[in-house]
């Protein structure tokens, strides 16, 4: 028969024959040939292979740098990396996740529109009218004016972005 | 700081067993593979086995299969090596390992280890 | 298994020698650590990963190789080198250690 010049999914084609890819978490020690099957051997400690294979040697499972803002999140096994994410209050400068950076803070007269997580930063908006932040958090969200009316006060002083409006008493018209 | 406390010596009898443990502190066993080595008087180091504290799943080389069982207590951060049949040949120090994946390199951190001695 | 013979098993060195010590695979691995033990206390990492070194070690320290040869060398041995040395494979299961190599200041 004609040797083949392609093979199936999970096989490879080595001296004109299909020999069986090594699966995730394994390395390959040697091809198979004609009367032999493919051989392969777990990927050792601190190593890993994702994917079917014919690699010889296992890739490192990756370091979470504590110097770098980071920590472990799942460690490695023989067939996944080791997942890192940021330390409490920073989050990832990259979808790789190879160091961190602190979640950005948003300034008076911008409240937090979304909380950071260990992979986004914090979104900030803009407070609308009704609406202020008086102080720079990555947390406190704009809050609404206080609403003179339902204390049966009267609005003083407008508010802003950044201030709360200050509410008085009402003027007592004479007599 | 990353500790590892071991548990005290132990003198015991043949045909007995002993369980010896490992509490961890500064990180958590999850993040680590548990190995245990053996080191008998006089004599160089040999890798008893190491267990995954996730899943529990363990290897072990082949000659103490069946003379070691490796367990782990997540809740107390503990790892625990029993070794039953006890001979005079598993008179040794006892090493808990961890391969810790917040470490920058494997096998950083040792402890003092356990000594054990089989003796009537 | 994979068997780790290291040679020579006992050295000594006088201060200011180089050393190399050699720890040889019956097959081949991905990469090798070097551990350093004195007497009473238990071992520790020195070499990481065939040629790393651990933090506080000091650079006369070096670790190469690849396959089924490798090598720890002091460029200038120190009193306090002195100390069993044990290579070992992380590669295969199960990981194995070579018996070690005893280094002793002459």
């Known amino acids: 028969p004609e040797p083949p010049t392609a093979c199936r999914e999970k096989q490879y084609l080595i001296n004109s024959q299909c020999c069986s890819l090594c699966q995730p978490g394994q390395k390959l020690v040697s091809d198979c040939t004609e009367f032999t099957e493919t051989e392969c051997l777990p990927c050792g400690e601190s190593e890993f292979l994702d994917t079917w294979n014919r690699e010889t040697h296992c890739h490192q499972h990756k370091y979470c740098d504590p110097n770098l803002g980071l920590r472990v999140q799942q460690k490695g096994t023989s067939e996944t990396d080791t997942i890192c994410t940021c330390e409490e209050g920073w989050h990832c400068t990259s979808e790789a996740c190879e160091s961190c950076v602190l979640h950005r803070s948003c300034s008076p007269g911008f409240g937090v529109k979304q909380i950071a997580t260990g992979v986004s930063d914090t979104i900030c908006e803009p407070c609308p009218v009704g609406f202020f932040s008086n102080v720079s958090s990555a947390f406190e969200k704009c809050h609404p004016w206080t609403s003179c009316e339902t204390k049966d006060l009267v609005v003083q002083q407008a508010g802003t972005n950044k201030t709360d409006v200050v509410c008085g008493p009402q003027d007592r018209l004479r007599a | 700081e990353v500790m590892l406390v071991e548990s005290g010596a132990e003198l015991v009898r043949p045909g007995a067993s002993v369980k010896l443990s490992c509490t961890a502190s500064?990180?958590?066993?999850?993040?680590?593979?548990i190995h245990w080595m053996i080191q008998r008087p006089e004599q160089g180091l040999e890798w008893i086995g190491r267990?995954?504290?996730?899943?529990?799943?363990?290897n072990f080389d082949p000659k103490f299969r069946g003379k070691a069982t490796l367990t782990t207590d997540t809740s107390s951060n503990t790892a625990y090596l029993q070794l039953s049949s006890l001979t005079s040949e598993d008179t040794a120090v006892y090493y808990c390992?961890?391969?810790?994946?917040?470490?920058?390199?494997?096998?950083?951190?040792w402890g003092q280890g356990t000594t054990v001695t089989v003796s009537s | 298994q994979i068997v780790l013979t290291q040679s020579p098993a006992i050295m000594s060195a006088s201060p200011g020698e180089k050393v190399t010590m050699t720890c040889s695979g019956s097959?081949?691995?991905?990469?090798m650590h070097w551990f350093q033990q004195k007497p009473g206390n238990s071992p520790k990492i020195w070499i990481y990963?065939?040629?790393n070194l651990a933090s506080g070690v000091p650079a006369r320290f070096s670790g190469s190789g690849s396959g089924t040869s490798y090598s720890l060398t002091i460029s200038r041995m120190e009193a306090g080198d002195a100390a069993t040395y044990y290579c070992?494979?992380?590669?295969?299961?199960?990981?194995?250690f070579g018996a070690g190599t005893k280094l002793e200041l002459k």
């Open positions: 070992q494979q992380g590669s295969t299961y199960p990981l194995t």
């Open positions: 267990i995954d504290p996730t899943n529990g799943n363990t």
């Open positions: 097959s081949s691995v991905s990469y």
């Open positions: 500064g990180f958590k066993i999850k993040d680590s593979y």
């Open positions: 390992v961890p391969n810790y994946y917040g470490s920058r390199y494997p096998f950083s951190y």
């Open positions: 990963f065939t040629s």
